[in-house]
Amino acid sequence: VEVQVSEDPVVALVDTDATLRCSFSPEPGFSLAQLNLIWQLTDTKQLVHSFTEGRDQGSAYSNRTALFPDLLVQGNASLRLQRVRVTDEGSYTCFVSIQDFDSAAVSLQVAAPYSKPSMTLEPNKDLRPGNMVTITCSSYQGYPEAEVFWKDGQGVPLTGNVTTSQMANERGLFDVHSVLRVVLGANGTYSCLVRNPVLQQDAHGSVTITGQPLTF
């Protein structure tokens, strides 16, 4: 028996369902009574789901996994993972034994889009050209860690005096805070781009300083 899985990682959004594809080619006359199917976490060997003894043994992984029972006899050993969490990320091994056996691993990459950044300025009044200001760009609830880029109004990257921190919350999602310290010109626009490297999703925020008032 030859097991086939997708070579590319499966990308799943947090709180959505994901399908880890695994298939085998059953011989003519194949019956489910002959099938032993085991899904494990590749690294720890923890059991995720199994089909043995002619029956679905059920989820062994937080009761969020399911097979496709009607498709098993056709050689579809795929695993459905419901309500994906950050902690589900990793490699899963699909092991199939009929008369002989084979296994293959499929990777799950979890992702969550970042929110539109909010911009704050300190100080935020009585600003004069030549003042040093701190601009903070905050974006929330994304995964994995973001890439943050700053640009001025002409699109020129601002790399000096940037401090970016990323903190994971209890769900493993990241809140990003990036601080740019800059000397004000006569007027200017400062843009922050928060990029999710897996989703290739960009979230933009900007602040324009034109004397008073400020526009965000």
């Epitope: 032993n36 085991i38 494990q40 976490l41 720890t44 060997k45 923890q46 059991l47 995720v48 199994s50 043995t52 003894e53 043994q57 059920g58 989820s59 062994a60 091994t93 092991f95 034994s97 002989d100 056996f101 296994s103």
Partner: antibody, heavy 123, light 107 residues
Amino acid sequence: EVQLVESGGGLVQPGGSLRLSCAASGFTFSDYGMGWVRQAPGKGLEWVSSISWDSSSKEYADSVKGRFTISRDNSKNTLYLQMNSLRAEDTAVYYCARAWIAIIGGGAHFDYWGQGTLVTVSS
Amino acid sequence: DIQMTQSPSSLSASVGDRVTITCRASQSVSSHLAWYQQKPGKAPKLLIYLTSSLQSGVPSRFSGSGSGTDFTLTISSLQPEDFATYYCMQSKSLPFTFGQGTKVEIK
């Protein structure tokens, strides 16, 4: 008939080494995961280590990690356990056991066991 | 690690009695629980796997039930050869862990 026969046990001083062997017969050895389970005198059973059919996966109990090494020779139908830096608490009967499938870990319970070999660590 | 707790630790029974041994896991092991019988100086012998599947060659008086965290091994009519120590083992995740054993003695 599935048969597993352990050998290599004996008396060894603390800090010493032993190599246990398990000769398998009555089944296609290379189609199954294998493992070692031990039982201290008058005590219960403790899983020690497991190895997959092709030796690609090897797992160890925390209590022996870094000291014990599991291996297999499919051409000789033999399972091994190299035990180094032995301690008094390693004193036990060591059983060789067959996993019911080729892989190890979750879902791969042991279905056949050998009679065991006694390892005594004492000065 | 998953902790397995068996009860009772020992029991006395007579031939023909119905005997029940329980095993509790510290977290769900789904259906991946096995029962072994061990006689003095002998190797453990698999009786039940996947909670309720009877191993080939094991008498039908042995049965298993349960799911998740609570499991039971039942011997419907105890026979002289059944006096032994019984262990449960979870095989959901490594390290595999065993109950402390239940010794079944002759009353």
